[in-house]
């Protein structure tokens, strides 16, 4: 069977402060079953940015309906961007379990923030 791919098509995205940023992510297969989570940074200290199952993410929304059957688009939109949001964002696929097991990460998308045009 074909190996699951997590595709983040943009290496980098530049957004003006105050605007929204869209970070794209698609998966190549619906199998195995399990969630997608978004993180900023790599390593033990990475920050959780979005998790459909639970959590508090007031500025982050899913671009597509992630609950829809056969959905393979896990892109997110972050509103009201500030310079503090800059960083590299990773879309990560997990296999459902107790706990969920990390399977594959996208290559990352670097978000840079431009000064708001005057």
């Amino acid at each position: 069977e074909e190996e699951l791919q997590v595709i983040q098509p943009e290496k980098s995205v530049s957004v003006a402060a105050g605007d929204s940023a869209t970070l794209n992510c698609t998966v190549s297969s619906l199998i195995p079953v399990g969630p997608i989570q978004w993180f900023r940074g790599a390593g033990p200290g990475r920050e959780l940015i979005y998790n459909l199952k639970e959590g508090h993410f007031p500025r982050v929304t899913a671009v597509s309906d992630p609950t829809k059957r056969n959905n393979m688009d896990f892109s997110i939109r972050i509103s009201n961007i500030t310079p503090a949001d800059a960083g590299t964002y990773y879309c990560v696929k997990f296999r459902k379990g107790s706990p969920d097991v990390e399977l594959k990460s996208g290559a990352g998308t670097e978000l840079s923030v431009r000064a708001k045009p005057s």
Epitope: P44, E47, L48, G55, H56, G87, D100
Partner: antibody, heavy 117, light 108 residues
């Protein structure tokens, strides 16, 4: 304001156990890794353990197999279960919030653990 | 494990003077080096990360420089509240997270 408050320190004998707690507030606890760092009297800083947002745990070699880090996201609380304590574990234990850059941006005031017979 | 060596161990400086001290890594850490300040009886405070980026609320008199294995923290004009111990920490290779042994900045 971000606040981290450690508790549970005290005086114990070698071989005994202690459980430290760290109550967090002022940030979304579930979204961040948290860590323990200790400082022996008059000495420098030594990283002890870290738990990631997904629950993956990491330990310094000096405590591996004796200490267990855990988190209760529903209570915004970090724990450190310390078993088989030794004299060299005597230190102030700090909990800290970890940034995505893997640095420690907010620290508690610490709790003193003394291991002595 | 990356070993960080700080020098000097103690630095005696007069208020208003410039203070410079260093941190050397046993292998390259790129720009992934942080600095912390600790005053007696207090918790450490993050000053600098990524070698030269000041943390939130840190005054401009604190500046970091360097890359690879050699790093420097400079305090341009020492204020009374700057007398403390300063630690470096690498944030590129984990675990373990490693700290330097510290530099104590005391009043001359």
């Amino acid at each position: 304001d971000v606040q981290l408050v450690e508790s549970g320190g005290g005086l114990v004998r070698p071989g005994e156990s202690l459980r430290l707690s760290c109550a967090a507030s002022g940030f979304t606890f579930t979204n961040y890794a948290v860590t323990w760092v200790r400082q022996a009297p008059g000495e420098g800083l030594e990283w002890v353990s870290l738990i990631s947002v997904t629950g993956t745990t990491y330990y310094a070699d000096s405590v591996k197999g004796r200490f267990t880090i855990s988190r209760d996201n529903s209570k915004s609380t970090l724990y450190l279960q310390m078993n088989g304590l030794r004299a060299e574990d005597t230190a102030v234990y700090y909990c800290a919030k970890v940034t995505w850059k893997n640095v420690f941006d907010y620290w508690g005031l610490g709790t003193l653990v003394t291991v002595s017979s | 494990e990356i070993v960080l060596t700080q020098s000097p161990g103690t630095l005696s400086v007069s208020p208003g003077e410039r203070a410079t001290f260093s941190c050397r890594a046993s292998q390259t850490v790129g720009s992934k080096l942080a600095w912390y300040q600790q005053k007696p009886g207090q918790a450490p405070r993050l000053l600098i990360y990524d070698a030269n980026t000041r943390a939130t609320g840190i005054p401009a008199r604190f500046s970091g420089s360097g890359s690879g294995t050699e790093f420097t923290l400079t305090i341009s004009s020492l204020q009374s509240e700057d007398f403390a111990v300063y630690y470096c920490q690498q944030h590129t290779d984990w675990p373990p997270y490693t700290f330097g042994g510290g530099t104590k900045v005391e009043i001359k």
